[in-house]
C-alpha cells in the first residue's frame, strides 16, 4: 500500500528573515534504516528540487543552500525541511515526497508575511490652517507583506471611505509600502485615524493626526515626532520621524540639528553649516537630505541591534530652539517552538512526563502559556526560563510536568508582547505504549 | 517663582568629605538634567559634573573624577555632590544649575562656598 | 587652559560697541548650543545669550552670533553697569563635558 505521509493542513506562517520549519512526516516500519530512504522536498508547482536524501546520505539543499534537515530524527520519520531566512519570492507550495519500498507525498503551503511599520502622517499644507481648508493628508506604512488593508476613520471613530486614495508597492524584497491618501475639508478641529492591517498576521498598525486649525505660537521651534514608540524588527531599519516647520526664506544653512541619545547625551549624527556632518553612532545612521529643506528631519538607524533600544532626541536650532525625544521599541519575533518528551517511549496513561517548549531568538522577553487539548490553562508545574545570548536576544525554554491521562494534547504557545505575535507548537500523546515524536 | 538653593558648604581640612546639596523649587526638577560648577577664588567657572533626569547617567570633569558623585533625588527635588578626599586646589564657590534640553544652563543658585584648608 | 579661547580683557567708553569672540572646536560650539554668561562682582553667573536667543529680561543692547567653531557676543551703547565678566560655555559631545573661556573682564572706562 502506499506509504502515508502527513503535513500540517494548515499553511504555515513565516515572517520575512525568520527561520520556518515545513513539518512532513512518515512512519517507519521496524526494521526500517535510512539506506532505504529517498526523500525529496520539491516545489508542487514547478518540480524544481530544493532538499533531497538519498543512498543514506543528506545530499544537501539545491535552495540556496538555505535549507536543512533535521538528520537525527529522520530515522524516526521526521522529514521536516527548515528553511532558514525566509523571503517572499519562497512563499507558496513544497512537496514531502517519500519513498522506501512505497511511496508517499503530501504539499504543505508556505505564506509569506512580514509587519507593516507604525504608519507616519504627513500633511499637506501643513501651517497656517483654518477651518474650511482643504487638506490632504497622507498615511504610509513601509516593508510589510502581503499586501495591506487600509482603513480611515474619524474622531469619533465612523469610517471615512471618500476621497481615499491607496497605492502599493513592492520593492525589490518583494515587500510593500503603501501610501493612503485622504482628502478632508477641516472642521473646526479633527482627528484623522489610518488604519494598515496585514491580513495575514492580523496585526494593525495605526497613527493618527489631530489638526487643530489655527497659526502655531511663534518663539520655540516646534519639533514634532511621534508620540507611540517606533517598532523594529532585529537587523531591519528604522526611520526616526522628526520634523519641524521652517519659515518662509528658510535655508539650509541655519539649520543646525543634532540627533543624540536622550539618557547620555551621546551624539548620533549631526546637521551643521549647512553639511551633513555624519553618523557617529557606528556609521549605522543617515539623514534624508532632500527632505530635509521642507523640515523633515527623520533619522534612518540601519540594521537594529537590541542595544540601540531607547530614547533618541532630536534637537533643532534655527534661530531658536526646539527638541523632542523618541522611543525605539525593539523587538525579534520568536520561532516556532520545539517540543520535546521525557521520557520519550513506552509511555503509559499515568506516567509522569516532562514537556519542554523551546522557541528561540526573540525580543523582548516572551509570555508563555500552556493549554490542554480542551485549550484549558495548564499553570501549574510550569517552569519557565530565558536567556539572553550576545546580541540580547532571548531564548526561552518552558517545562511542563503532566501525568499522561489515556490520551492528551498538550500546547505550548509563546508570546511577542510587543509584535503581538504568538508563535505555538503542540504535543499529542495518544495510545499505549507510544514513542515520541511520532510526527514533527 | 524658578529657583536653585545651594546648602552644606564649610571649611574641612584636606583629604576630608563634604556634601553639597541643592534644592529645586519652582519647576519639574525631574525633567531637567543638572550639573554643578565651581569658581575659585579670582579664577574662571570650571564645570564639575552633570547628570541626567533619572540619575542613570552621570559625567565629571577629570580633575574631580573618582573623588566627587552627584546624584539625585527627583522625590525630594534635590541635586547632591558628594566631595571626599578633598584638596586645597578644591576651593571655590559651588554653584548648581539647571542644565535644558537645550544645552542651555538657564538658571543657576546663588552659590555656597567650599574652603579646603589645615 | 580653557577648551575655549576668550580674550582676557576688553574696554570701551560709554555709548560705544564693543565685541567678545570665543573660539572652539567642531564638537563644542561647531554644532552645540553656545551661551554667554554675565558675571557681576559677588553674584552668581546670569544667562545673557543662546546662540542668538536672549532670554527674556536680558537687553537688546546684547547680541549674539555663531559662525562655524566661533561666536562673538557683542554689546551695543555701553553702559556702566555691564562691567563684569563674560564667559562663553558649550556642551562638548566629545569631552562629555561642559567647557567654559577663560573669562573676558569688561571695563567701561
Known amino acids: 500500500g502506499a506509504l502515508e505521509v502527513q503535513v500540517p493542513e494548515d499553511p504555515v506562517v513565516a515572517l520575512v528573515g525568520t527561520d520556518a520549519t515545513l513539518c512532513c512526516s512518515f512512519s517507519p516500519e521496524p526494521g526500517f534504516s535510512l539506506a532505504q530512504l529517498n526523500l525529496i522536498w520539491q516545489l508542487t508547482d514547478t518540480k524544481q528540487l530544493v532538499h533531497s536524501f538519498a543512498e543514506g546520505q543528506d545530499q544537501g539543499s539545491a535552495y540556496a543552500n538555505r535549507t536543512a534537515l533535521f538528520p537525527d530524527l529522520l530515522a524516526q520519520g521526521n522529514a521536516s525541511l527548515r528553511l532558514q531566512r525566509v523571503r517572499v519570492a519562497d512563499e507558496g507550495s513544497f512537496t514531502c515526497f517519500v519513498s522506501i519500498r512505497d511511496f508517499g507525498s503530501a504539499a504543505v503551503s508556505l505564506q509569506v508575511a512580514a509587519p507593516y511599520s507604525k504608519p507616519s502622517m504627513t500633511l499637506e499644507p501643513n501651517k497656517d490652517l483654518r477651518p474650511g481648508d482643504t487638506v490632504t493628508i497622507t498615511c504610509s506604512s513601509y516593508q510589510g507583506y502581503p499586501e495591506a488593508e487600509v482603513f480611515w476613520q474619524d474622531g469619533q471613530g465612523v469610517p471615512l471611505t471618500g476621497n481615499v486614495t491607496t497605492s502599493q508597492m513592492a520593492n525589490e524584497q518583494g515587500l510593500f509600502d503603501v501610501h493612503s491618501i485622504l482628502r478632508v475639508v477641516l472642521g473646526a478641529n479633527g482627528t484623522y485615524s489610518c488604519l494598515v492591517r496585514n491580513p495575514v498576521l492580523q496585526q494593525d498598525a495605526h497613527s493618527s493626526v489631530t489638526i487643530t486649525p489655527q497659526r502655531s505660537p511663534t518663539g520655540a521651534v516646534e519639533v514634532q515626532v511621534p508620540e507611540d514608540p517606533v517598532v523594529a524588527l532585529v537587523g531591519t531599519d528604522a526611520t526616526l520621524r522628526c520634523s519641524f516647520s521652517p519659515e518662509p526664506g528658510f535655508s539650509l544653512a541655519q539649520l543646525n540639528l543634532i540627533w543624540q541619545l536622550t539618557d547620555t547625551k551621546q551624539l548620533v549624527h549631526s546637521f551643521t553649516e549647512g553639511r551633513d556632518q555624519g553618523s557617529a553612532y557606528a556609521n549605522r545612521t543617515a539623514l534624508f537630505p532632500d527632505l530635509l529643506a521642507q523640515g523633515n528631519a527623520s533619522l534612518r538607524l540601519q540594521r537594529v541591534r537590541v542595544a540601540d533600544e531607547g530614547s533618541f532626541t532630536c534637537f533643532v536650532s534655527i534661530r531658536d530652539f526646539g527638541s523632542a525625544a523618541v522611543s525605539l521599541q525593539v523587538a525579534a519575533p520568536y520561532s516556532k517552538p520545539s517540543m520535546t518528551l521525557e521520557p520519550n517511549k513506552d509511555l503509559r496513561p499515568g506516567d509522569t512526563v516532562t514537556i519542554t517548549c523551546s522557541s528561540y531568538r526573540g525580543y523582548p522577553e516572551a509570555e508563555v502559556f500552556w493549554q490542554d487539548g480542551q485549550g484549558v490553562p495548564l499553570t501549574g508545574n510550569v517552569t519557565t526560563s530565558q536567556m539572553a545570548n550576545e546580541q540580547g536576544l532571548f531564548d526561552v525554554h518552558s517545562v511542563l510536568r503532566v501525568v499522561l491521562g489515556a490520551n492528551g494534547t498538550y500546547s505550548c504557545l509563546v508570546r511577542n508582547p510587543v509584535l503581538q505575535q504568538d508563535a505555538h507548537g503542540s504535543v499529542t500523546i495518544t495510545g499505549q505504549p507510544m514513542t515520541f515524536p511520532p510526527e514533527a | 517663582e524658578v529657583q536653585l538653593l545651594e546648602s552644606g558648604g564649610g571649611l574641612v581640612q584636606p583629604g576630608g568629605s563634604l556634601r553639597l546639596s541643592c534644592a529645586a523649587s519652582g519647576f519639574t526638577f525631574s525633567s531637567y538634567w543638572m550639573s554643578w560648577v565651581r569658581q575659585a577664588p579670582g579664577k574662571g567657572l570650571e564645570w564639575v559634573a552633570g547628570i541626567n533626569r533619572n540619575g542613570g547617567t552621570t559625567y565629571y570633569a577629570d580633575s574631580v573624577k573618582g573623588r566627587f558623585t552627584i546624584s539625585r533625588d527627583n522625590s525630594k527635588n534635590t541635586l547632591y555632590l558628594q566631595m571626599n578626599s578633598l584638596r586645597a586646589e578644591d576651593t571655590a564657590v559651588y554653584y548648581c544649575a539647571r542644565w535644558n534640553d537645550y544645552d542651555i544652563m538657564d538658571v543657576w543658585g546663588q552659590g555656597t562656598t567650599v574652603t579646603v584648608s589645615s | 587652559q580653557s577648551v575655549l579661547t576668550q580674550p582676557p580683557s576688553a574696554s570701551g567708553t560709554p555709548g560705544q560697541r564693543v565685541t567678545i569672540s570665543c573660539s572652539g572646536s567642531s564638537s563644542n560650539i561647531g554644532r552645540r548650543t553656545v551661551n554667554w554668561y554675565q558675571q557681576l562682582p559677588g553674584t552668581a553667573p546670569k544667562l545673557l545669550i543662546s546662540n542668538s536667543q536672549r532670554p527674556s529680561g536680558v537687553p537688546d543692547r546684547f547680541s549674539g552670533s555663531k559662525s562655524g567653531t566661533s561666536a562673538s557676543l557683542a554689546i551695543t551703547g555701553l553702559q556702566s553697569e555691564d562691567e563684569a565678566d563674560y564667559y562663553c560655555?558649550?556642551?562638548?559631545?566629545?569631552?562629555?563635558?561642559?567647557?567654559f573661556g577663560g573669562g573676558t573682564k569688561l571695563t567701561v572706562l
Open positions: 560655555a558649550s556642551w562638548d559631545d566629545s569631552l562629555n563635558t561642559w567647557v
